[in-house]
């Protein structure tokens, strides 16, 4: 017998569905209506046929009582080709739910999203995470999606984006957004970061994650943040191949005084980069290629400095390379 596609845990808390059949029995997902965390993976299926079965233009208020009874707070939908009209229909219905965190992974959104009807209610999400989601509408996708959300979004994560730059003139401000994660967009680069950080649209950012985004120098990132008026408290630049030296012709950049935590781990650094903020609470330089202990004048004034996993800490250690095994003194880097 084939395994059931969905599994609900004993506490009715987490429900995971993996639909891999060409014509899945979607009614199997019904058991997930009791769950708080729901994951639905559609095996790369095209959900276009669903449009024939559902009236995407129906008034979602007719489902309001049922949807209000759902316990789901965290929903992940993955691996499907989804017509924009169907996505919108789902967002309209979920607006009556208690859903707080939505994750979309490995999706291809086809067609354009219609504008929000005047009487429609936006979805009150606190967290939206997108990974490898492509949109037929190109750069305007964030503005189109944003109109279906209430303005209280606190966390936005966009990874493996096909178009990480946004159509800034169409995007409205995210007044409550405190965490923006653009990690795992290796083609972004510093110029792309300038295009993605729409000026004055992210006024409340406290945490900015830019892991594996093709950043080149802390100074270049500083310039992009300054241009956008973004003043994070915490900045993660780990897993970028950073240059320690600054282009002499580049103007010096003044970091925001709000920045108190900077992660430069796994950045391939052989020396402490120039142009760091003058004062930090936390600086993480672990798992780099520092061959000697940084001199006090090379470092910012810092309360909490992490240097684990650098060659200078273990006498006789060569530069770490991928796949190398370090002794027990050095963490696996």
């Amino acid at each position: 017998t084939t395994p059931e596609p969905c599994e609900l845990d004993d506490e009715d808390f987490r429900c995971v569905c993996n639909f891999s059949e060409p014509q899945p029995d979607w009614s199997e997902a019904f058991q997930c209506v009791s769950a708080v965390e729901v994951e639905i993976h559609a095996g790369g299926l095209n959900l276009e046929p669903f449009l024939k079965r559902v009236d995407a233009d129906a008034d979602p208020r007719q489902y309001a009582d049922t949807v209000k009874a759902l316990r789901v707070r965290r929903l992940t939908v993955g691996a499907a080709q989804v017509p924009a009209q169907l996505l919108v229909g789902a967002l309209r219905v979920l607006a009556y739910s208690r859903l707080k965190e939505l994750t979309l992974e490995d999706l291809k959104i086809t067609g354009t999203m219609p504008p929000l009807p005047l009487e429609a209610t936006g979805l009150a999400l606190s967290s939206l995470r997108l990974r490898n989601v492509s949109w037929a509408t190109g750069r305007s996708w964030l503005a189109e999606l944003q109109q279906w959300l209430k303005p209280g979004l606190k966390v936005l994560s966009i990874a493996q984006a096909h178009s990480p730059a946004f159509s800034c003139e169409q995007v409205r401000a995210f007044p409550a957004l405190t965490s923006l994660d653009l990690s795992d967009n290796p083609g972004l680069g510093e110029r792309g970061l300038m295009a993605a950080l729409c000026p004055h649209k992210f006024p409340a950012i406290q945490n900015l994650a830019l892991r594996n985004t093709g950043m080149e120098t802390p100074t270049g990132v500083c310039a992009a943040l300054a241009a956008a008026g973004v003043q994070p408290h915490s900045l993660d630049l780990s897993h970028n191949s950073l240059r320690a030296t600054v282009n002499p012709s580049a103007p010096r950049c003044m970091w925001s005084s709000a920045l108190n935590s900077l992660n430069l781990s796994f950045a391939g650094l052989e020396q402490v980069p120039k142009g760091l903020p003058a004062k930090l609470r936390v600086l993480d330089l672990s798992c780099n290629r520092l061959n000697r202990a940084p001199q006090p004048d090379e470092l910012p004034e810092v309360d909490n400095l992490t240097l684990d996993g650098n060659p200078f800490l273990v006498p006789g250690t060569a530069l770490p390379h991928e796949g190398s095994m370090n002794s027990g003194v050095v963490p696996a880097c």
Epitope: E4, E7, L8, D9, D10, E11, D12, F30, Q31, V33, S34, T66, A69, L70, R71
Partner: nanobody, 115 residues
């Protein structure tokens, strides 16, 4: 191990009604989603009706408006009230308890609708 026992099937005239019952026994520690499914000779098993632990219901397209699923007062008892029965409702009706690891199915009860 969980056992499911269906009852209430039988022979009925078209337009008539039947009420199926399903009782679950064994190691059940929480109220679980349950459902009714049916299989007619030579056809795939199809979902008839489902009910969640919180009482949310879902019906197959062919039975909407005619069949009603409900839960009993006991932890895992489920009923299927079938009205305005049609010959195409003839099938073996199975009860299902959604359960972690491997779902439990009953042995089935025969429903025959004559024209």
């Amino acid at each position: 191990q969980v056992q499911l026992q269906e009852s209430g099937g039988g022979l009925v005239q078209a337009g008539g009604s039947l009420r199926l019952s399903c009782a679950a026994s064994g190691r059940i520690f929480s109220i679980r989603p349950m459902g009714w499914y049916r299989q007619a000779p030579g056809k795939e098993r199809e979902m008839v009706a489902q009910i969640s632990s919180s009482g949310i219901t879902n019906y197959g397209d062919s039975v909407k408006g005619r069949f009603t699923i409900s839960r009993g007062n006991a932890r895992n008892t489920v009923y299927l009230q079938m009205n305005n029965l049609k010959p195409e409702d003839t099938a073996v009706y199975y009860c299902r308890l959604f359960k972690t690891g491997a779902d439990s199915w009953g042995q089935g009860t025969q429903v025959t609708v004559s024209s």
